[in-house]
């Protein structure tokens, strides 16, 4: 019967997926930076704010050189899923003071979801082991006060900003290894 007909190319390949992930991460970083600045303008922060349920920062500048593709992608997806849940929680639990930022928080959540899907696709295409994206979440109770939700927003946006910052660097470095 002769050689079989080939398949047409699908819309992307792993390297294009990685490029797309870098672009999405950069765009999300810019959004987060802008939203954090808006927060500081509207609700000046009195020092650094922490939230115990947020993931600890995965990487430092010193460890970038030793990054491995599976570890970075797995950790990034797990951390971003946690931030996704925290943004969801913030939108639900936010008092009237944060309602003015609802459109921006909604857009941030949608972009986070898009990036998570792109990372999952990349891991599938590379056949890397994937931690379940919806691992049981730390239950997040309602903030104690309006000021509590503002502090939480500062912490979430600050942590997400740092995470996305190392993610851009890490993904760019991984591009050279794929």
């Amino acid at each position: 019967p002769g050689p079989p007909a080939g398949s047409p190319r699908v819309s992307s390949d792993p390297r294009a997926d990685l490029d797309s992930a870098v672009l999405l991460t950069r765009s999300l970083l810019a959004d987060t930076r802008q939203l954090a600045a808006q927060m500081r303008d509207k609700f000046p922060a009195d020092g650094d704010h922490n939230l115990d349920s947020l993931p600890t920062l995965a990487m430092s500048a010193g460890t970038l050189g030793s990054l491995q593709l599976p570890g970075v992608l797995t950790r990034l997806r797990v951390d971003l899923m946690s931030y996704f849940r925290h943004v969801q929680w913030l939108r639900r639990a936010a008092g009237p003071s944060l309602k003015t930022l609802e459109p921006e928080l909604g857009a941030l959540q949608a972009r986070l979801e898009r990036l998570l899907r792109r990372l999952q696709l990349l891991m599938s295409r590379l056949a890397l082991p994937q931690a379940a994206p919806d691992q049981p979440a730390v239950p997040l109770g309602p903030p104690a006060s309006a000021w509590g939700s503002i502090r939480a927003a500062h912490a979430i946006l600050g942590g997400l900003h740092l995470t996305l910052d190392w993610a851009v660097r890490g993904l760019l470095l991984l591009k050279t290894r794929l």
Partner: antibody, heavy 114, light 111 residues
Framework: EVQLLESGGGLVQPGGSLRLSCAAS????????MHWVRQAPGKGLEWVAV????????YYADSVKGRFTISRDNSKNTLYLQMNSLRAEDTAVYYC???????WGQGTLVTVSS | QSVLTQPPSASGTPGQRVTISCSGS?????????VHWYQQLPGTAPKLLIY???ERPSGVPDRFSGSKSGTSASLAISGLRSEDEADYYC???????????FGGGTKLTVL
């Protein structure tokens, strides 16, 4: 155009061995995880094994664990499946597939019968 | 027994819209893994139809669409044509297998 061309199928007796090969072209083979998926006559698709883009991760369906070995040679753009201790229930068309899987070969028939 | 559950058959007349469902378990769809759909025409190899729940590869007509909600996913085919008669399979990554799992397949008949 992407092409995946399987070879090595045929008739083998129970307990015997076969080695399937899959030659890839038209895409960056070394950037894709690769799978073997099989389909018994008149049945649905069953995933068999997967190997990561660089060969560092390999996973198998329970039904073939310990009997089948997946491997790849990125310098030759070729995927392999070494099948030992074959059983009648391994009779199927074996497809080589790339990525999600995004791309599939046309398949090679493996018949295990005495 | 397939890990993902699909109806064994579906049918419709030309021009109609049909949907095929796919439900999973805690180690695949319920865990948030994306769903992919394949079309297998009689006597041929499977072909990727939808990936990442709703994305269409280039060359796939926009009559085909996918969606996912919570614990299940579905494939919709609008403006049904005779050439759509085929077997359709859903698939998702499974964390207990470290590989993809497939549905049992749905045979679509165009009446």
């Amino acid at each position: 155009e992407v092409q995946l061309l399987e070879s090595g199928g045929g008739l083998v007796q129970p307990g015997g061995s076969l080695r399937l090969s899959c030659a890839a072209s038209g895409f960056t083979f070394s950037s894709y995880g690769m799978h073997w998926v099989r389909q018994a006559p008149g049945k649905g698709l069953e995933w068999v094994a997967v190997i990561s883009y660089d060969g560092s991760y390999k996973y198998y369906a329970d039904s073939v664990k310990g009997r089948f070995t997946i491997s790849r040679d990125n310098s030759k753009n070729t995927l392999y499946l070494q099948m030992n201790s074959l059983r009648a229930e391994d009779t199927a068309v074996y497809y080589c597939a790339a990525g999600v899987p995004d791309y599939w070969g046309q398949g090679t028939l493996v018949t295990v019968s005495s | 027994q397939s890990v993902l559950t699909q109806p064994p058959s579906a049918s419709g007349t030309p021009g109609q819209r049909v949907t095929i469902s796919c439900s999973g378990s805690s180690s695949n769809i319920w865990s948030g893994y994306d769903v992919h759909w394949y079309q297998q025409l009689p006597g041929t190899a499977p072909k990727l139809l939808i990936y990442s729940n709703e994305e269409r590869p280039s060359g796939v007509p926009d009559r085909f669409s996918g969606s996912k909600s919570g614990t299940s996913a579905s494939l919709a085919i609008s403006g049904l044509r005779s050439e759509d008669e085929a077997d359709y399979y859903c698939a998702a990554w499974d964390s207990s297998l470290y590989g993809p799992v497939f549905g049992g397949g749905t045979k679509l008949t165009v009446l």
